[in-house]
């Protein structure tokens, strides 16, 4: 079935109730226009946005009978010159009849004839009328036979875009058929179709056709009221493509639209061959869309590649929600233009201030205002990244000018990133050097504390992202905000003790749920004692409240836990609820406390695994005395796991070799490498080792490079030459093989000759090395440090 | 063809205000803009500014804003271009050009000889 | 004072290859198109290159416009004794808000 039919169904079933054969039809008020019910318009009670009007009438090829319900009868059959007047084209019946067309109509043959209802004659420039009645065996005769085709065509064979040869010169009649049911010959609607007749079929249609000749280009370069567009056509080179075949619509801006344009803009864009092409194609549809099709918003792909609005209000076309087509359905032999009173201008080939909407209008203000904007160069590469204008309170605008512009610059990137660009992890530098993290999560896209929302622009010189927030770049470490705040003192105290206070000073991604003193009320000195003695248990409570990784609250499907593993091992659930983040239940009462090496959110309870039983009835005590919002099982005599720490130092350790090399146990995360004099060079890339994605991590220095692996982290290491690097090279030649992997609880492992030369890029040979034995040598003191 | 013709040659004295005609043909007026350059003895061209025949705005130079005031007569397809509070350094031939605004200045009047003297 | 700089004169014999330079900012040149100018003694001028190398039509393909950055350049081969003239650059300029013109080249046909 086609559109069309199942449209007719559908009115079919809507008007059933009034007896057989009924159709519900949908009038706008206000007009004479009316329509068969589509599901969505009916549903609506309104078309292009104006209030309807339910009329039932019979469907087409049935009639009334007096006394009876509906529609029971079928409407007489007879040949297409009766028919005419069988649909009420009377006018259309008189026109065949004076012009000689009628013995032709209601002989021999098989007809489709497309005929203008009574009032589409009325609505006919007079002048072009008259010209027919005038000379009623050519002109008259011609006209009509332009409405005619040689052949039985129901709507079910009238296909979209097809192009059929019409009984005149063979002038080709173009046909649409729509989705929403609507079918046109050159834009003409059909508003009743497939009246049977024993020669052929009527279709009664809106309007008169009139003939086509001409191309799009054609229109073109005669229309004086174009010559705006037609030049910038020439310029952009399309004119000459408007010529040739298709089915295109055009959005064609009349010379008083390019003069609403601002001057300065219209020259940009005309001096720059990207820009104006751009501007060129976004009036095109390589579609060919008929004004009378047009019965709700719909979203065009245009030849530009972005999308435009086409919607209407009542009569009127509106394209991005703007009332501005002022002349419909100029129909050529290539497609249909629509005049229009506005340029359409692309993103494309805007600037990337000029992406702002009106809901970042302060932002873009103050871009201008404090002289910002000049140093967005049109032929740069910038990137916006625009908080909403809620975003800017009253004691920011009324900041120090200088401050606002630091702030200002932290929002404009140096390089143009599409949404597409944005990674978990990437660093993004802005014009005032500073570097602003992104973090990626389910639903949400977030730099620093700030998360994106929809809206995402990319213009000529830029894109632009819009944030909920001003995004502020983090200064500070994890532990040097603790330290800072007066209401973490009891969390850092046994941070400390618990030698973890490295772990939030040094480099990295974590997220940390920071219980203020509020959480340790009622903690006597003798229970902290008692948590401080047992450092396992301290060391496992406090890395519950880390959690590897940047989750910020905002980045949050609101209303879903989101389940993550702390560094303690256990989960942590957390939702976002009404702008307020839930940690196991628990109200955050602040979050997205941005920091160099992390986010703080900050809870005012103890929180503690679920999992994880205690077996000391002191602890429990204190535990229970903390925490209420979970009931902590008690195991008498378990005890808590040791974490390895290792797993979270730093990746470097330096190590000062004195005299000859001896051996070491090397724990998880551990490596030994010889001091390294000047900067590495990091390389990171992804192996697949075992079947499981590895980041590998290379340091170099000279010929030296570190292999960082999930667990464990060998070193290669050469040395320039000299007594003591021939000692090493020595050694490593010997002795390379002799590596443990340290596992907590368990025995040790050696990896197999394969083993190392995978992890080790097939770059050492390796000695196949009896399984358990442990090469361990004297300790020595050894200074430890960092990589920076 | 297109055509614009220019009033004639004016002599005025400081402070006085000229007023210079411009009559196209060849084309729809209303269609296009009209823009007003002029040309000093021996110097180069200046913008002036630019009326729309369609909707009668406006565009004029800031230099001479306040001064200039550009005018349109569909009816007989004729702009006009007065400059109030004549200087000497006014003196000048004043063109008035078709103005697409794509293209710009495609067609120029024969210029109109505007001399300021006392 | 122009806003443009253009080279005072420039010469060349019949069918030799003349470049006249026009030299902006970022506020004219750098972010708007160049149109050109003809201006033959004694007569009004003509549009010869518009969106720095557009030429209407009429004008011939021996006029050849380019720009580059903040500067724009004509380019006049097989140059004929009906090319002597001043040629004057134009382009919009953002922070006057004013279309402002060069100070014109004489070409010289010797």
């Known amino acids: 079935n086609s559109y069309y039919d199942k449209v007719l169904a559908h009115s079919r079933i809507r008007g059933r109730d009034q007896g057989p054969n009924v159709c519900a039809l949908q009038q706008i008020l206000g007009t004479k226009k009316k329509y068969f019910s589509s599901c969505k318009n009916w549903y609506q009670g309104a078309i292009c946005g104006k209030k309807t009007t339910v009329l039932y009438e019979c469907c087409p090829g049935y009639m009334r009978m007096e006394g009876m319900k509906g529609c029971p009868a079928v409407m007489p059959i007879d040949h297409v010159y009766g028919t005419l007047g069988i649909v009420g084209a009377t006018t259309t019946q008189h026109y065949s009849d004076v012009s000689k067309l009628r013995e032709e109509i209601e002989g021999k043959g098989s007809y489709t004839y497309f005929a203008p209802s009574n009032e589409a004659w009325e609505n006919l420039d007079s002048d072009i009328r008259r010209g027919l009645e005038n000379n009623v065996n050519v002109e008259l005769l011609n006209a009509l036979h332009s409405h005619m085709v040689n052949k039985r065509m129901l709507t079910k064979d009238l296909k979209h875009g097809m192009v059929i040869p019409s009984m005149y010169n063979n002038l080709g009649l173009f046909i649409n058929h729509y989705p929403n049911g609507v079918v046109t010959v050159n834009c003409a609607r059909v508003i009743h179709g497939n009246q049977i007749a024993t020669n052929g079929v009527v279709h009664v249609i809106d309007r008169v056709l009139t003939q086509i000749g001409t191309s799009i280009q054609d229109f073109l370069e005669a229309e004086d009221d174009l010559s705006s567009f037609r030049a910038a056509a020439i310029t952009s080179d399309l004119l000459e493509s408007l010529g040739r075949d298709g089915h295109f619509t055009l959005f064609a801006p009349t010379n008083e639209a390019f003069e609403k344009l601002p001057r300065g803009v219209l020259e940009r864009i005309m001096g720059d061959k990207v820009a104006s092409e751009a501007l060129m194609k976004y009036h095109i549809l390589n579609t060919l869309q008929c004004s009378e099709a047009i019965t709700g918003g719909a979203v065009f792909e245009t030849m530009e590649g972005n999308t435009i609005e086409i919607g209407c209000e009542g009569d009127s076309i509106s394209i991005n929600g703007i009332k501005m087509v002022n002349k419909k359905d100029i129909v050529t032999k290539n497609g249909v233009i629509h005049l229009i009173d506005e340029v359409l201008i692309p993103d494309s080939a805007k600037q990337v201030i000029e992406l702002a909407g009106k809901q970042q209008t302060t932002f873009t203000d103050l871009v201008a205002q404090l002289g910002l904007a000049s140093s967005l160069k049109p032929d740069g590469e910038y990137t916006l990244l625009a908080p909403v204008n809620n975003a800017f309170s009253d004691d920011t605008l009324s900041m120090d000018q200088r401050l606002l512009k630091l702030i200002l610059q932290n929002h404009i990137l140096k390089v143009k990133v599409g949404l597409s660009d944005l990674y978990n992890g990437q660093i993004l530098e802005t014009i005032g050097g500073k570097q602003l993290r992104v973090f990626v999560y389910r639903t949400a896209i977030c730099i620093e504390n700030s998360c994106m929302v929809r809206g995402s622009k990319q213009g000529r010189n830029g894109a632009i992202h819009i944030f909920r927030e001003i995004i502020q770049p983090a200064e500070k470490s994890l532990h040097d905000k603790l330290r800072q705040d007066k209401r973490f003192s009891i969390f850092l105290s046994l941070l400390e003790a618990a030698d973890l206070k490295d772990l939030l000073t040094q480099p990295g991604d974590w997220t940390l749920f920071a219980p203020t003193n509020d959480a340790f009320k009622g903690m006597t000195s003798e229970e902290r004692e008692l948590l401080i003695g047992d450092k396992n248990a301290l060391q496992n409570i406090i890395l519950y409240h880390l959690t590897p990784g940047v989750y910020i609250g905002k980045g949050f499907e609101p209303g879903v836990t989101n389940i993550l593993k702390t560094t303690q091992g256990s989960k942590i659930y957390l939702k976002g609820v009404n702008e307020t983040l839930l940690v196991n239940e628990l109200k955050s009462k602040e979050s997205d406390i941005m920091t160099t090496n992390g986010v703080i959110h900050v809870v005012d309870k103890l929180l503690y695994p679920a999992d994880i039983p205690v077996g000391n009835d002191q602890l429990l005590e204190l535990l229970n005395k903390l925490i209420k919002y979970i009931q902590i099982k008690f195991v008498r005599g378990s005890t808590f796991k040791e974490i390895p720490m290792t797993v979270y130092r730093p990746a470097m350790t330096k190590i000062q070799i004195e005299g000859d090399p001896d051996f070491r146990l090397i724990k998880e995360g551990e490596t030994v490498t010889e001091v390294i004099h000047g900067e590495p060079v990091i390389k990171k890339y992804t192996k697949i080792i075992d079947g499981v994605p590895v980041e590998i991590t290379e340091k170099q220095t000279r010929e030296e490079r570190i292999i960082t692996g999930p667990e464990i982290k060998y070193t290669r290491i050469s040395t320039g030459g000299g007594e003591t690097g021939e000692t090493l090279q020595k050694f490593l030649q010997k002795e390379v093989s002799k590596v443990t992997k340290f596992i907590e609880g368990g025995d040790g492992h050696l990896f197999e000759d394969e083993e190392i030369k995978r992890l080790l890029q097939g770059d050492t040979p390796a000695k196949k090395i009896p399984a358990n034995k442990r090469v361990q040598g004297p300790r020595r003191r050894s200074r430890e440090g960092r990589s920076q | 063809q297109v055509q614009l013709v220019q009033s004639g040659a004016e002599v005025k004295k400081p402070g006085a205000s000229v007023k210079v005609s411009c009559k196209a043909s060849?084309?729809?007026?209303?269609?296009?803009?009209i823009s007003w350059v002029r040309q000093a003895p021996g110097q180069g061209l200046e913008w002036m500014g630019w009326i729309s025949a369609y909707t009668g705005n406006t565009n004029y130079a800031q230099k001479l804003q306040g001064r200039v005031t550009m005018t349109t007569d569909t009816s007989t397809s004729t702009a006009y271009m007065e400059l109030r509070s004549l200087r000497s350094d006014d003196t000048a031939v004043y063109y008035c050009?078709?103005?697409?605004?794509?293209?710009?200045?495609?067609?120029w009047g024969q210029g109109t000889l505007v001399t300021v003297s006392s | 004072q122009s806003v443009l700089t253009q080279s005072s004169s420039a010469s060349g014999t019949p069918g030799q290859t003349v470049t006249v330079s026009c030299s902006g900012s970022?506020?004219?040149?750098?972010?708007?198109?160049v149109n050109w100018y003809q201006q033959l003694p004694g007569t009004a001028p003509k549009l010869l290159i518009y969106s720095n190398d557009q030429r209407p039509s009429g004008v011939p393909d021996r006029f050849s416009g380019s720009k580059s950055g903040t500067s724009a350049s004509l380019a006049i081969s097989g140059l004929q004794s009906a090319d002597e003239a001043d040629y004057y650059c134009?382009?919009?300029?953002?922070?006057?808000?004013?279309?402002?013109f060069g100070s014109g080249t004489k070409v010289t046909v010797l």
């Open positions: 970022s506020s004219d040149i750098g972010s708007n198109r």
């Open positions: 134009a382009a919009w300029d953002d922070s006057l808000s004013t279309y402002v």
């Open positions: 050009a078709r103005d697409v605004l794509v293209v710009p200045f495609d067609y």
């Open positions: 060849g084309y729809t007026f209303t269609s296009y803009g």
